[in-house]
C-alpha cells in the first residue's frame, strides 16, 4: 500500500455540514450539506449521506455532532452510539471504523434540566476508490442541528 | 478553489498552548502561547489570540479546552460554549466555524464534589491569507489551565 | 525546523487499535494492535505501546479511549486522566504532550446506572527520530475495549 | 485581603435553635467562592456543617441536614447558619470559612473567622 | 461518607527532627486533600492543597505527598513555632472529611 503524494496533484478533503434535512428517521445514515456555507468537497464525491472515494489512499476522517435534550424522558436511549462506518462493494454489510459511545442523558439531574453534549471522533483509515463513508448516530434524535458548525463530517487524505 | 502542495514548500501548521495569559476576562478571545514549550508556529502568525493565516488554503483546525470545577451552584454556567470563530477583513463580524456546546456540571453529583470535562474540535475550513481564526469559551472562567497539555489550540494545511 | 514535504517520499501515518492484550495492569502505557483489521504503520514503527518516530517532523498524533462503567463504585478514581506522552532519549521522563481530565463518573445518578464517556484527544507536536509516543489513561479500568473501533491511538505526518 | 467575622449568642437552651452570621469584609461575596461553616467540639476534632454559594446553592452534611439552614444576604455581604433541635452534643466553636471557588479545581478552606463558641446549656 | 485516618494522633519531636504524619482515605480521593495547622485557642490555617501544593507564604519546610488514599505530610526541619494539631481534610466527595488530627509537641 505504498501512496505518493504528488505535488502537482489536489490533495482529496471535505467537510459537509448537518442541516435540517440531516436526520431522517429512517433508520439510514445522516445526510449533510455539501455546498453551502462551510462545506465542500474536493477529490471526494457525496451520496446519500456518504463521501465516496475517488482516489484510493489513507484519510484522516472526523465526525462531530451536537448532542442536547430537556431532561431525560423515559424511551430515550440512555447510551447514544455515534459512528463512522465504511461501506464497501466487497462486503454486504457496514463496516465500523471508528466509534463512540456515550451517556450524556445521564447529566440532567432533574427532569426538566436542559443538557448539551458532544461526540467527536477522528482517526486513519485506509479506503479505496468507490468505498464509502457515512455517519450514523443511534439515538439520532438526540443530535441538535442548527447552522452547521455543530453537527459535521469530514475527510482529508494524509 | 484548486490548491496545489509543492513539495519544496513548507506545509503551513501551528499548535499554540494554553497560559496564565489566556483567560482575559474581557469578554474577548482565548489568547495562546506561541513559542515556549510545545508552542510552535511554522507558515502561520499571531495576533492577539488569532491565528493569521499567510497562505490560502484548506486547514484542519482544531482546539481543545480542559473545564473544571468545585460543585455546580446555580448561577455559574450550565451550558458552556466552545469554538473555533473567523474573523475577515471582507465581513465585520466573527463567523463560527466549529462550535460545540457541553453541560458538563451536570456531571457533579449530589455527593461528588470536583469535575472535570474536555472539550475538543477539528475541522476542515478554507481560510484566506489574512483571515484569523480564534477560539473563545463562554463561560471562560470554567477552562482550567495548566501546562500548555490541557488547552490548546492548532492547524495545519491539508 | 524547516521540514519539506518530497512528493516521491511516503508521509508517515499509522493507526493502533485497542485489543484485549491493551490493558495491561501494570503502570505502563496501553498496548495497541499493528496489524490486524483497521491497524496498520506506514514510515513509524511500535514498541511496547509505543509509536516510534521514523522521520523527524510534525505529526498529528491522536488517541480515543472509550470510558465506562456500572455505577460509580468506591475505589475508583472520580478523575479519569487520558494523555499522549513523549518518551526522548535525551530526558529521563515521560513528557505530556496533550492531556484531558474527566469525571465520566458523574453521570451515573444511581449506584446500577450503567455509563458510557468518549475521550478523544488530537494535536500538532514536533518528534524526532528515535522518540516515542505512548498513551496512558488513570484509572485504566475503566477502558473499555471492544473491537479496536472505540479505542485507538494514531498519528501522520503534516 | 478578605475576612471573615462571625457573630451570634454565645448561649443557646437545648432545643432551641442556634443562629449565626458570617460578615465578609475585604471582598465580595458574590465571587465564584463556596462558604463554609466548620465546627470544633471541645477538645475534638473538626466536623464541616454545610456550605453555601451566592446564588444560593447550598450543600450540608448529611448528619445535620435536618437541622441546617444556611442562607445568604447579598445586599449585607453575608452569610448565616441556623441550627434548630440543638443539644449538648452540638456545644462547639464555630468557624466560617471561605472554600475554593466553584470556577476552580481546588477546595481548601484559605480563610477563617477567629471562631465564635456556643454553649447549649439551660 | 468518606473517612480519613490519620496517624499517628500525637507525636513528640526534637526541634531540627523531620516528622512525617499520615493520613489514609477510606476511598480513592485522588490529589483532592488538604492539610491545615491548628495553633492553641486559633482557627486552623491551610498548609498544604491538592495534596502537595503549598499555600502562598508558607514556609517550605511543609511539604505534602501521595495520591489516591494514602497521604503524608512532612515537616522537613521542627521549629518551636510548629507547635500545634495537624489536620488532613478530602473534598472528592461530600461530606468534606477531616481526619481527627496529630499533635506535634517539642521533647
Known amino acids: 500500500l505504498i501512496q505518493e503524494r504528488r505535488s502537482h496533484e489536489v490533495n482529496p478533503a471535505a467537510h459537509l455540514t448537518g442541516a435540517n434535512s440531516s436526520l431522517t428517521g429512517s433508520g439510514g445514515p445522516l445526510l449533510w450539506e455539501t455546498q453551502l456555507g462551510l462545506a465542500f468537497l474536493r477529490g471526494l464525491s457525496y451520496h446519500d449521506g456518504a463521501l465516496v472515494v475517488t482516489k484510493a489512499g489513507y484519510y484522516y476522517i472526523y465526525s462531530k455532532v451536537q448532542l442536547g435534550g430537556v431532561g431525560c424522558p423515559l424511551g430515550l436511549a440512555s447510551t447514544i452510539t455515534h459512528g463512522l462506518y465504511k461501506r464497501t462493494p466487497r462486503y454486504p454489510e457496514e463496516l465500523e471504523l471508528l466509534v463512540s459511545q456515550q451517556s450524556p442523558c445521564g447529566r440532567a439531574t432533574s427532569s426538566s434540566r436542559v443538557w448539551w453534549d458532544s461526540s467527536f471522533l477522528g482517526g486513519v483509515v485506509h479506503l479505496e476508490a468507490g468505498e464509502k463513508v457515512v455517519v450514523r448516530v443511534l439515538d439520532e434524535r438526540l443530535v441538535r442541528l442548527r447552522d452547521g458548525t455543530r453537527s459535521y463530517f469530514g475527510a482529508f487524505m494524509v | 478553489l484548486i490548491q496545489e502542495r509543492r513539495s519544496h514548500e513548507v506545509n503551513p501548521a501551528a499548535h499554540l498552548t494554553g497560559a496564565n495569559s489566556s483567560l482575559t476576562g474581557s469578554g474577548g478571545p482565548l489568547l495562546w502561547e506561541t513559542q515556549l514549550g510545545l508552542a510552535f508556529l511554522r507558515g502561520l502568525s499571531y495576533h492577539d489570540g488569532a491565528l493569521v493565516v499567510t497562505k490560502a488554503g484548506y486547514y484542519y483546525i482544531y482546539s481543545k479546552v480542559q473545564l473544571g470545577g468545585v460543585g455546580c451552584p446555580l448561577g455559574l454556567a450550565s451550558t458552556i460554549t466552545h469554538g473555533l470563530y473567523k474573523r475577515t477583513p471582507r465581513y465585520p463580524e466573527e463567523l463560527e466555524l466549529l462550535v460545540s456546546q457541553q453541560s458538563p456540571c451536570g456531571r457533579a453529583t449530589s455527593s461528588s464534589r470536583v469535575w472535570w470535562d474536555s472539550s475538543f474540535l477539528g475541522g476542515v475550513v478554507h481560510l484566506e491569507a489574512g483571515e484569523k481564526v480564534v477560539v473563545r469559551v463562554l463561560d471562560e472562567r470554567l477552562v482550567r489551565l495548566r501546562d500548555g497539555t490541557r488547552s490548546y489550540f492548532g492547524a495545519f494545511m491539508v | 525546523l524547516i521540514q519539506e514535504r518530497r512528493s516521491h517520499e511516503v508521509n508517515p501515518a499509522a493507526h493502533l487499535t485497542g485489543a484485549n492484550s491493551s490493558l495491561t495492569g501494570s503502570g505502563g502505557p496501553l498496548l495497541w494492535e499493528t496489524q490486524l483489521g483497521l491497524a496498520f504503520l506506514r514510515g513509524l514503527s511500535y514498541h511496547d505501546g509505543a509509536l516510534v518516530v521514523t522521520k523527524a517532523g510534525y505529526y498529528y498524533i491522536y488517541s480515543k479511549v472509550q470510558l465506562g462503567g456500572v455505577g460509580c463504585p468506591l475505589g475508583l478514581a472520580s478523575t479519569i486522566t487520558h494523555g499522549l506522552y513523549k518518551r526522548t532519549p535525551r530526558y529521563p521522563e515521560e513528557l505530556e504532550l496533550l492531556v484531558s481530565q474527566q469525571s465520566p463518573c458523574g453521570r451515573a445518578t444511581s449506584s446500577s446506572r450503567v455509563w458510557w464517556d468518549s475521550s478523544f484527544l488530537g494535536g500538532v507536536v514536533h518528534l524526532e527520530a528515535g522518540e516515542k509516543v505512548v498513551v496512558r489513561v488513570l484509572d485504566e479500568r475503566l477502558v473499555r475495549l471492544r473491537d479496536g473501533t472505540r479505542s485507538y491511538f494514531g498519528a501522520f505526518m503534516v | 485581603q478578605v475576612q471573615l467575622q462571625e457573630s451570634g449568642p454565645g448561649l443557646v437552651k437545648p432545643s432551641g435553635t442556634l443562629s449565626l452570621t458570617c460578615a465578609v469584609s475585604g471582598g465580595s461575596i458574590s465571587s465564584t467562592h463556596w462558604w463554609n461553616w466548620v465546627r470544633q467540639p471541645p477538645g475534638k476534632g473538626l466536623e464541616w456543617i454545610g456550605e453555601?454559594?451566592?446564588?444560593?446553592?447550598?450543600n450540608c452534611n448529611p448528619s445535620l441536614k435536618s437541622r441546617v439552614t444556611i442562607s445568604v444576604d447579598k445586599s449585607k455581604n453575608q452569610f448565616s447558619l441556623k441550627m434548630n433541635s440543638v443539644t449538648a452534643a452540638d456545644t462547639a466553636v464555630y468557624y466560617c470559612?471561605?472554600?475554593?471557588?466553584?470556577?476552580?479545581?481546588?477546595?481548601?478552606?484559605?480563610?477563617w473567622g477567629q471562631g465564635t463558641t456556643v454553649t447549649v446549656s439551660s | 461518607d468518606i473517612q480519613m485516618t490519620q496517624s499517628p494522633s500525637s507525636l513528640s519531636a526534637s526541634v531540627g527532627d523531620r516528622v512525617s504524619i499520615t493520613c489514609q482515605a477510606s476511598?480513592?480521593?485522588?490529589?483532592?486533600l488538604n492539610w491545615y495547622q491548628q495553633k492553641p485557642g486559633k482557627a486552623p490555617k491551610l498548609l498544604i492543597y491538592?495534596?502537595?501544593n503549598l499555600e502562598t507564604g508558607v514556609p517550605s519546610r511543609f511539604s505534602g505527598s501521595g495520591s489516591g488514599t494514602d497521604f503524608t505530610f512532612t515537616i522537613s526541619s521542627l521549629q518551636p513555632e510548629d507547635i500545634a494539631t495537624y489536620y488532613c481534610?478530602?473534598?472528592?466527595?461530600?461530606?468534606?472529611?477531616f481526619g481527627g488530627g496529630t499533635k506535634v509537641e517539642i521533647k
Open positions: 476511598q480513592d480521593i485522588s490529589n483532592y
Open positions: 470559612t471561605r472554600g475554593g471557588a466553584a470556577a476552580g479545581t481546588n477546595y481548601g478552606l484559605d480563610v
Open positions: 491538592d495534596a502537595s
Open positions: 481534610q478530602q473534598y472528592d466527595n461530600l461530606p468534606l472529611t
Open positions: 453555601i454559594y451566592h446564588s444560593g446553592s447550598t
